[in-house]
């Protein structure tokens, strides 16, 4: 038995451009907390698989309020270690998952919202009792600095916490070569059961310090494959110097214990010692229960109808996953119609509609022209969610309230003069051109004439609208 300890030193924006200034969203202040999850072995496990070696949750950190102009420092973190106790042997190889969670403290209906900010997953080898291992990991734009170690809890000692210390009343009780069991002076180490380094898979021992080999293996530590002939005919313990042995079939052969369970022989049978999170005769049943607190983000753990059935998490709106660990991007489904802007408020979706549309999902097309008068004889045209006025000649602007100068665009070609007229405009063409916009040259044999200005208008007069 022992404890895995994780110390978070810092969590903050990683180096380089695009680093976030704040872990908080625009909704307001937030605070951080961490979750550590330990899984046995080095295999890539599904994110949803249980933390069979254990898990722990930190306290909440101090409230962080972004200072917009300040550089983003390391963020205020929860105090103290994260400790994950383990009951059985320390496996040595394990997967370490560290999650940084954000608790938003803004004005949320029903309270704060939790979301996963960063997840670091690393496969590691680590002996119990060793020094702190330091690490720096990146998760997206964030950087996490941390240290970790595994330590045994007395009376367990050793790199796997499988050797036991035994109490002693006097120094003479410690056998030859056995040291006091640090850090307690009045205890000493139990002798190592096998010679140091003896193969766990291919060796065994009956006396302290020996290393006897199973069939097909040889060498002082049973690491060397041997030709099977050297052991032919041998049954039971061998007196040969190679230490070769062909054991009779035992109940623990092939290790019937699943999920990292350790097998021990009992009279005529075997017994599996299961890692945390598993139980059953062969550790075949996943034993994560509601008591382990597997549901995050306010999820409710609903146990099965009987103790052997798995839990399920009922997730609050906005979260999903077997442990409510994934935030749902509900806006990705584009629920707002007609170009509406989607806002995920946590407790609900809100659509901000474009002009001319309304309804929870902007599904209602308003009558754009209702109550919208176009002045000066203009007519209202619906379309695109916003009303538009088609103005009478001589008027312009959104509501046809502005006077328009039909000559402003210089519509008369080839030097023709433009005269504003109540019905539009008239072009007085220069010699050699004709047409309503003076666009056509007069044929060489034709006669050109400068049209007279319309009655009551002289070139250059201000426009008059009748």
């Amino acid at each position: 038995a022992g404890v895995f300890e994780l110390q978070i030193h810092s969590f903050g924006p990683g180096p380089g451009p695009g680093a976030p200034r704040s872990p908080c969203s625009a909704r307001g202040p937030c605070r951080l907390f961490f979750r550590v999850c330990l899984k046995p072995g080095l295999s890539e496990e599904a994110a949803e698989s249980p933390c069979a070696l254990g898990a722990a949750l930190s306290a909440r950190g101090p409230v962080y309020t972004e200072q917009p102009e300040a550089p983003a420092p390391d963020l205020p973190l929860p105090n103290g270690l994260l400790q994950v106790p383990f009951r059985d042997a320390w496996p040595g190889t394990f997967s370490l998952i560290i999650e940084t969670w954000r608790e938003e403290l803004g004005d949320q209906i029903g309270g704060p919202a939790w979301s996963l900010l960063a997840r670091v997953t690393r496969r590691r080898r680590l002996a119990a009792g060793g020094p702190w291992a330091r690490d720096i990991q990146r998760a997206g734009a964030w950087e996490l600095r941390f240290s970790y170690r595994a330590r045994c809890e007395l009376p367990a000692v050793g790199t796997a916490c499988t050797r036991l210390c035994r109490p002693r009343s006097a120094p003479s009780r410690c056998g030859p070569g056995l040291r006091p069991c640090a850090p307690l002076e009045d205890e000493c180490e139990a002798p190592p059961v096998c010679r140091a380094g003896c193969s766990l898979e291919h060796g065994f021992c009956e006396q302290p310090g020996e290393c006897r080999c199973l069939e097909g293996w040889t060498g002082p530590l049973c690491m060397v494959p041997a030709s099977t002939s050297s052991c032919l005919g041998l049954r039971g313990p061998s007196s040969a110097t190679t230490g070769c042995l062909v054991p009779g079939p035992g109940p623990c052969d092939g290790n019937p214990c699943a999920n990292g369970g350790s097998c021990s022989e009992t009279p005529g049978s075997f017994e599996c010692t299961c890692p945390r999170g598993f139980y059953g005769l062969r550790c075949e049943v996943s034993g994560v229960t509601c008591a382990d607190g597997p549901c995050f983000n306010g999820g409710l753990c609903v146990g099965g109808a009987d103790p052997d059935s798995a839990y399920i998490c009922h997730c609050p709106p906005g979260f999903q996953g077997s442990n409510c660990e994934k935030r749902v991007d509900r806006c990705s489904l584009q629920p707002c119609r007609n170009g509406g802007l989607c806002l995920d408020l946590g407790h609900a979706l809100r659509c901000r509609c474009r002009a001319g549309f309304a309804g929870p999902r902007c599904e209602h097309n308003l009558d754009d022209c209702a109550g919208r008068a176009c002045a000066n004889g203009g007519t209202c045209v619906e379309g695109g969610g916003a009303h538009r006025c088609s103005c009478a000649l001589g008027f312009g602007g959104r509501d046809c309230r502005e006077r328009a100068d039909p000559c402003a665009a210089r519509p008369c070609a080839h030097g023709g003069r433009c005269y504003a007229h109540f019905s539009g405009l008239v072009c007085a063409c220069a010699p050699g051109y004709m047409g309503s916009r003076c666009e056509f040259p007069v044929h060489p044999d034709g006669v050109s004439a400068l049209p007279a200005a319309p009655p009551g208008l002289r070139p250059g007069d201000p426009q008059r609208y009748l």
Partner: antibody, heavy 118, light 108 residues
């Protein structure tokens, strides 16, 4: 402002089915879990069950065999049916909204007293 | 199921005094998923605290919650006349959702 209003018969005969409806205003029934809770006169609170618009339900094991909770999203209503009632089911029945941050109750109806008596 | 035991059953205090209400769980409540409610006669309960220590919207800061694991406390720093009521705790860690039996705070 979120408001919940329970309504239904105030008197139910033993062995019959108690039926109550809760009308929600100020919040979409599709955006939250909704629950029923009851309180016998002079006693504490007892959770009956909850529902999500998708059909997810969860009932108190002590009442599970007799309870059905349903929602009508078009009317923004939830309903409670409790069958085979006895005098022990006499209580004030509350509908309540379950918060987003967890399965606690942030808005409650004013409650309706249902008496089981012949 | 998690059984919540509230103590004392009744707390007799005067306005201005400090009230300390206890809620003890039969099993550890994970992630401090515990809420407190206030109920006055003839009214529905009102949410005060969630997450063991977070005040709900509009709740005065004289109400505070603390605790973790199996032991939780609601503290009213200075009792106001409107605070005399029954207080319930509720766990929402696992199903079934359960309430404590309540603590009545009445005027001495």
């Amino acid at each position: 402002q979120v408001q919940l209003q329970e309504w239904g018969p105030g008197l139910v005969k033993p062995s019959e089915t108690l039926s109550l409806t809760c009308t929600v205003s100020g919040a979409s029934i599709s955006s939250f879990y909704w629950s029923w809770i009851r309180q016998p006169p002079g006693k504490g609170l007892e959770w009956i069950g909850y529902i999500y618009y998708s059909g997810t339900t969860n009932y108190n094991p002590s009442l599970k065999s007799r309870v059905t909770i349903s929602v009508d999203t078009s009317k923004n209503q939830l309903s409670l049916k409790l069958s085979s009632v006895t005098a022990a089911d006499t209580a004030v029945y509350y509908c309540a909204r379950i918060a987003v941050a967890g399965f606690f109750f942030d808005y409650w109806g004013q409650g309706t007293l249902v008496t089981v008596s012949s | 199921e998690i059984v919540l035991t509230q103590s004392p059953g009744t707390l007799s205090l005067s306005p201005g005094e400090r009230a300390t209400l206890s809620c003890r769980a039969s099993q550890s409540v994970n992630k401090n998923y515990l809420a407190w409610y206030q109920q006055k006669p003839g009214q529905a309960p009102r949410l005060l605290i969630y997450g063991a220590s977070s005040r709900a919207t509009g709740i005065p800061d004289r109400f505070s919650g603390s605790g973790s694991g199996t032991d939780f406390t609601l503290t009213i720093s200075r009792l106001e006349p409107e605070d005399f009521a029954v207080y319930y705790c509720q766990q929402y860690d696992r199903s079934p959702l359960t309430f404590g039996g309540g603590t009545k705070v009445d005027i001495k």
